[in-house]
């Protein structure tokens, strides 16, 4: 996930937000799966 050539603060911010959203989605899926399997 190189996410482009820009290293300014806005590009870094958008990349950080994307990572947080992605992790939240992944963890959310895992939690739902765990609940379903119980």
């Amino acid at each position: 996930h190189s996410d482009g050539i820009f290293t300014d603060s806005y590009s870094r911010y958008r990349k950080q937000m994307a990572v947080k959203k992605y992790l939240a989605a992944v963890l959310g899926k895992r939690y739902k799966q765990r609940v379903k399997n119980k």
């Epitope: 190189s2 482009g4 937000m17």
Partner: antibody, heavy 109, light 111 residues
């Protein structure tokens, strides 16, 4: 970078636009979509990160969906009205540093 | 959504002169500098000129200069050339990307 899929559709018809690239690997870049109505200014639609997470302009209201594969980025549009008639551009990076020539979508009854 | 207000069109300039285009945002952009400028000629897609308020994009001539912070930004073209005749747009990036928006555009006419 090149867009495709634009055509004449009637109001309410869904339409999917595709963005591809030759010579560059799109998978390593965030990609954005922008539109421009005939004779009007630019309008930011939204973008998709390398992780597949998306952000949209507040006016989109869930009508448009951006997604991606390893080689393409797509813009799915629903509930189209005549107001959506425009040239649709995809562009690379959050700063929209490299643009395609655009694809024209005409919504008319 | 944010509203970006640009200098009204058209702006006229003589070859070799200076053009100043202003862009005012209804709210502060992210980190006070998340603003870009684009040049668009008829029948062509826009081209990135400046990002992060003042950083020149790759391959853009140094006669283009971006400045400003917060809500007020300026694009200056020094030593205007015939090739600079185009419409110029600003784009603001915000804490909430849902607010991201372009300005209405400013047409530059070179005499």
């Amino acid at each position: 970078v090149e867009e495709s899929g634009g055509r004449l559709v009637t109001p309410g018809t869904p339409l999917t636009l595709t963005c591809t690239a030759s010579g560059i690997d799109l998978s390593g870049y965030a990609m954005g979509w922008v539109r421009q109505a005939p004779g009007k200014g630019l309008e930011w639609i939204g973008d998709i990160s390398t992780y597949g997470t998306t952000d949209y302009a507040s006016w989109v209201n869930g009508r448009f969906t951006i997604s991606r594969t390893s080689t393409t980025v797509t813009l799915k549009m629903t509930s189209l009205t005549t107001e959506d008639t425009a040239t649709y551009f995809c562009a690379r990076d959050y700063w929209l540093s490299l643009w395609g020539p655009g694809t024209l979508v005409t919504v008319s009854s | 959504a944010a509203v970006l207000t640009q200098t009204p069109s058209p702006v006229s300039a003589a070859v070799g002169g200076t053009v100043t285009i202003k862009c005012q945002s209804s709210q502060s952009v992210y980190d006070n500098n998340a603003l870009a400028w684009y040049q668009q000629k008829p029948g062509q897609p826009p081209k990135l000129l400046i990002y992060a308020a003042s950083t020149l994009a790759s391959g853009v001539p140094s006669r283009f200069k971006g400045s400003g912070s917060g809500t007020q930004f300026t694009l200056t073209i020094n030593g205007v050339q015939c090739d600079d005749a185009a419409t110029y747009y600003c784009l603001g990036g915000y804490d909430d990307p849902a607010d991201n928006a372009f300005g209405g555009g400013t047409e530059v006419v070179v005499k």
